[in-house]
């Protein structure tokens, strides 16, 4: 996801670091004036730069949304990281939400992943070991297991 | 928010010759240089060229050098890339972007940008 913007209407306070762009660029943790004669640094906590650049402005911190937890706080250097909260999962396919994991697996098949904040359970034949991706069909009788712990974080 | 909008592609014969534009609908590009990447079938995202819209100065991939011209006009918030003696091999979809990101400062290949237009399908064939 790309949660992310230039804010035009945020100016530099003037207690700012400034220093001189090198090759037109300013390091990571600045951007640099509309003049491209100074570089800024970012403001702790709002806003922040990964790479060299020229940005007229700072990108604006995530912040995480319900659903989420706060992995790393946002420095100058680096965005905030949010993570699913314990029992969600992010799909590839649909980022922008934390997606229930499943409680347990359909009946003749066993769980051999556990939840993780970017995964769901994983579930394979217990005979043939195949995978098994879909959803608990609604007739199914289920296996209660209780969802794995976030391990590390997820961006 | 800074929004771009490309336009100007379309079905060209080899050697023949495309004007790109893209227009900051935002009224800023949010950065003092734009570029333009392109992404061919199959492949990854390469860079083209970019401009520096205050003192244009100008940074091209050696694949388009000599063939491709990147222009801007400041007062109308619009960058354009002149494509010249075009190629089969310069088929893709053309993407403008602002917000370039580098890894070191004496480079003249941006890795990345934060800001991405819609891109313009540019193909060349007979």
């Known amino acids: 996801i790309t949660r992310q913007s230039l804010d035009p209407q945020r100016r530099a306070a003037p207690q700012q670091k400034r220093s001189s762009p090198t090759e037109g660029l300013c390091p990571p943790g600045h951007h640099i004036s509309e003049d491209s004669r100074e570089c800024i640094s970012c403001k702790y906590g709002q806003d922040y730069s990964t790479h060299w650049n020229d940005f007229l402005f700072c990108l604006r911190c995530t912040k995480c949304d319900s659903g989420e937890v706060e992995v790393n706080s946002c420095t100058t250097t680096r965005n905030t990281v949010c993570q699913c909260e314990e029992g969600t999962f992010r799909e590839e396919d649909s980022p922008e939400i934390c997606r229930k994991c499943r409680t347990g697996c359909p009946r003749g098949m066993v769980k051999v992943k556990d939840c993780t904040p970017w995964s769901d359970i994983e579930c394979v034949h217990k005979e043939s070991g195949t995978k098994h991706t879909g959803e608990v069909p609604a007739v199914e009788k289920t296996v209660t297991t209780s969802p794995g712990t976030p391990a590390s974080p997820c961006s | 928010e800074v929004q771009l909008l490309e336009s100007g592609g379309g079905l060209v014969q080899p050697g023949g010759s495309l004007r790109l534009s893209c227009a900051a609908s935002?009224?800023?590009?949010?950065?003092?240089?734009v570029g333009w990447f392109r992404q061919a079938p199959g492949k990854g995202r390469e860079f083209v060229s970019a401009?520096?819209?205050?003192?244009?100065?100008?940074y091209y991939a050696d694949s388009v050098k000599g063939r491709f011209t990147i222009s801007r006009d400041n007062s109308k918030n619009t960058v354009y890339l002149q494509m010249n003696s075009l190629r089969p091999e310069d088929t893709a979809v053309y993407y403008c972007?602002?917000?370039?990101?580098?890894?070191?400062?004496?480079?003249?290949?941006?890795?990345?940008?934060?800001?991405w237009g819609q891109g313009t399908l540019v193909t060349v064939s007979s």
């Open positions: 972007a602002a917000g370039l990101q580098y890894n070191r400062s004496a480079d003249r290949v941006p890795v990345g940008a934060v800001y």
């Open positions: 935002g009224r800023t590009f949010g950065s003092i240089r």
């Open positions: 401009i520096n819209r205050n003192d244009g100065t100008t």
